[in-house]
């Protein structure tokens, strides 16, 4: 028998520095977690103690904090090189700055193979990107070889900016011939490493003949055997065992997100490359694990540029940006409009001639808007200003919801109106009229939404049975501020870009902004 240790991360999302327990900015260092300096310590400890170790990343290193905003992927290459990852799969967010924003900072600089079997380049891009990412890689591990085959969510064109010269094929269809190729090369130990979410990970384990282990990402799935060490609730045991169609027991793993855990899976193979046993658990990277001095010093060095960036002007406002709770928790506020407009702008994807865009709607809890921005400071808007407006380090995500769920959400928005509560929704691509004289749960008297399957966008009444795409904060997607109906009834949820980054990019693009209060939210009774 031959034993392999698989260390794995996924959806790190730019958390190079240690974070608080909820993966936001570290405040009390003695209680902080994760970060590459701490990850390095644990990885080196395991590499010293065990003979056959692979360190793998299942995608979405890009996007999530000011680190990515400033360094644009160079930080990912630098620190992943320092940690000597053995392989990485491309995630959807690796395409957030377009193909060039992937090629230059990461693909050309990485000292490890970057993989995806189901992304095919065409046209002029094919020769430019050739060899920079691979469908699979055979890695020597001790006296054996292990094949790693990569995959990426086929939804990436709707979630990021891969352009028109990359085709995202069905994962299973693309993986099978690559695995078959590895088998003909006498590689009998094969790991599928990819970024399509836990459901697809399980399908790959079930359907792709010859895959021994699946290491996934995208869905931020936390798996654990026994008592979990922090706040995350396990979605199943670690590893999650799938019985394949040809009768094999295939372990499937994922390690939550944000570098909070290091996935740790021990696999025992027989001489024919069959999995005999698999066991392990994610390792919580808490403060009991010291941060490595060399990596930490490098982090401190790179950090300086971030501090300088946060005070630079992104653009100007010529109007007061009203982000006060007195406005945003009671009525339409222009800060809410600005943020929602930025959220939609960030999701412009012309993937189908029938649609002017795949999504037109935004909702945003008023309680998530934490500060106004005064225009009387020469109109200057900085990252620091935006961090005061959006201090929670969230993301703006894409969900699919039925019209009936949206209706419930808007009823919840005003079910206890007048108490300055955070659930009052700011909107984009939506016209809503409330009648507060009616009883809670029946106050939405008009709800019109902007069409997507149209050449001239116009507002049509919401249809209860229709499925709509909506951009909203991850806080709402997870049922925050009492929006349990969104969490319970959403049909799809894909995590998006860092909230501040979305707004800052929009302001930089527009250069001068002047959002108005324009009748997106109305009240039909005389009291408003």
């Amino acid at each position: 028998a031959w034993e392999l240790t698989i260390l794995h991360t996924n959806d790190v999302h730019s958390r190079l520095e240690q974070t608080s327990e909820d993966s936001s900015k570290c405040v009390n260092a003695s209680r902080c977690m994760g970060g590459v300096a701490r990850l390095f310590t644990k990885v080196q400890q395991i590499r010293r103690a065990e003979p056959n170790v692979l360190l793998l990343d299942a995608g979405d290193q890009y996007q999530g904090t000011i680190w990515f905003t400033v360094y644009k992927g160079a930080e990912v290459a630098h620190f992943m090189n320092a940690l000597r990852y053995d392989a990485m799969a491309l995630g959807n967010h690796e395409f957030d700055n377009g193909v060039e924003g992937l090629i230059e900072p990461l693909l050309k600089e990485a000292k490890f193979p970057i993989l995806s079997a189901n992304i095919k380049a065409k046209g002029p891009l094919a020769s430019q990107i050739s060899g920079l990412y691979l469908p699979y890689k055979v890695l020597p591990v001790g006296d054996e070889v292990v094949g790693i085959v990569g995959y990426t969510s086929k939804e990436t064109p709707f979630l990021s900016n891969p352009g028109t010269n990359l085709v995202f094929e069905d994962e299973i269809t693309a993986l099978q011939p690559e695995v078959d190729k590895l088998k003909t090369l006498n590689v009998n130990k094969i790991i599928a490493l990819g970024h399509s979410g836990f459901e697809m990970d399980k399908l790959i384990a079930q359907k792709v003949r010859g895959v021994d282990v699946v290491v996934g990402g995208h869905s931020n799935t936390f798996l654990y055997t026994g008592n979990p060490p922090s706040k995350e609730v396990p979605a199943g045991k670690y590893p999650f065992i799938v019985t394949s169609d040809d009768g094999r027991k295939v372990p499937v793993v994922q390690a939550y997100a944000f570098g909070k855990y290091l996935g740790y899976l021990k696999i025992e193979f027989d001489e024919r490359g069959n999995v005999i046993s698999s066991h392990g658990n994610p390792i919580l990277l808490n403060s009991s694990i010291p941060e490595d001095p060399s990596i930490k010093a490098d982090i401190n060095k790179w950090r300086i540029k971030l501090d300088n960036y946060s005070t630079q002007e992104l653009g100007k406002t010529i109007v007061y940006l009203d982000g006060s709770s007195q406005s945003c928790r009671f009525r339409e506020c222009n800060m809410g409009n600005l943020i929602c407009d930025a959220m939609i702008n960030n999701n412009l994807r012309h993937t189908d001639e029938m649609f002017w865009n795949h999504v037109s709607m935004c909702i945003l809890n008023g309680g998530g808007i934490r500060s106004p921005i005064d225009e009387r400071n020469n109109g200057t808007i900085t990252w620091e200003n935006l961090a005061a407006v959006l201090p929670f380090g969230g993301t703006f995500d894409l969900v699919q919801l039925k019209g009936s769920t949206l209706k419930k959400a808007f009823e919840h928005s005003v079910h206890r109106y007048g108490q300055s509560t955070g659930e009052f929704l700011q909107v984009g691509g939506i016209h809503v009229v409330y009648d507060l004289s009616r009883k809670p749960g029946d106050r939405v008297v008009k709800l019109d939404v902007l069409c997507t399957k149209c050449r001239v966008p116009s507002y049509d009444p919401l249809k209860m049975d229709e499925v709509y795409k909506v951009i909203l904060p991850n806080f709402l997607a997870n049922g925050g501020d009492g929006f349990q109906m969104i969490k319970d009834e959403l049909l799809r949820h894909d995590s998006g870009d860092q909230d501040i980054n979305v707004v800052s990019t929009y302001i930089s693009k527009m250069k001068v902004i002047y959002p108005a209060v324009e009748g997106r939210i109305k009240f039909s009774t005389g009291s408003h």
């Epitope: 390095f40 080196q44 590499r47 003979p51 170790v53 090189n81 320092a82 000597r84 053995d86 000292k111 591990v141 001095p293 060399s294 990596i295 930490k296 010093a297 490098d298 401190n300 060095k301």
Partner: antibody, heavy 120, light 111 residues
């Protein structure tokens, strides 16, 4: 366990070249830099340079850039140092030592050293 | 290049007592919040062993009787209590910048 195996001794003539080896085992060879050091009884330890086995990227001390050439053979997990135009000044113990691929990282494992004697 | 001056050149210490070796750098080896001074033990016929890195962090498998301290330009290695197995040469080394440089060494003997 991590091991860096070096031959015990080499005897060569002045004016010739020599290629010293360092065979790594017990870890992923391409995952760490390989450094070479020189120790003469009168001059202490001197850093010659380093090589990244992943892509053979090298970095030399100014003092040794015309004296030493660092190479690797990935498939055998072996690092080499070639020393050219040898003189008695090159007689020394030469160590290979591993470090994580970041400038400030320490030399965490060492070979036993090869004693090079340059003599006619 | 950063020059490291180690003192004393030799030191005799009784079993169970404290041995202190000093290392002074010609310029600061501090770098973004850390001091990159390392300490090694060298015994005849054995590969050198990393004892302490970044001034005070213990190397893997190093006994607790070895400790390091200091910052900027002044550093020390402490061994307490001294054991027979500790008879060796000790070197300091800076890894703040290349070329990496070493102290001249301290020979630790038994009194």
């Amino acid at each position: 366990q991590v091991q860096l195996q070096q031959p015990g001794a080499e005897l060569v003539r002045p004016g010739t070249s020599v290629k010293l080896s360092c065979k790594a085992s017990g870890y992923t060879f391409t995952g760490y830099w390989m450094n070479w050091l020189k120790q003469r009884p009168d001059q202490g330890l001197e850093w010659i340079g380093r090589i990244d086995p992943y892509d053979s990227e090298t970095h030399y001390s100014q003092k040794f850039k015309d004296k030493a050439i660092l190479t690797v053979h990935k498939s055998s997990s072996t690092a080499y140092i070639q020393l050219n135009s040898l003189t008695s000044e090159d007689s020394a113990v030469y160590y290979c030592t591993r470090s994580s691929p970041i400038t400030t990282a320490p030399f965490d494992y060492w070979g036993r050293g090869t004693t090079l004697t340059v003599s006619s | 290049n950063i020059v490291l001056t180690q003192s004393p050149a030799s030191l005799a210490v009784s079993l169970g007592q404290r041995a202190t070796i000093s290392c002074r750098a010609s310029e600061s080896v501090d770098y973004y919040g850390f001091s990159f001074m390392n300490w090694f033990q060298l015994k005849p016929g054995q590969p050198p062993k990393l004892l302490i890195y970044a001034a005070s962090t213990q190397g893997s498998g190093v006994p607790a009787r070895f400790s390091g301290s200091g910052s900027g330009t002044d550093f020390s290695l402490n061994i307490h209590p001294m054991e027979e197995d500790d008879i060796a040469m000790y070197f300091c080394q800076q890894s703040k910048e290349v070329p990496y440089t070493f102290g001249g060494g301290t020979k630790l003997e038994l009194k």
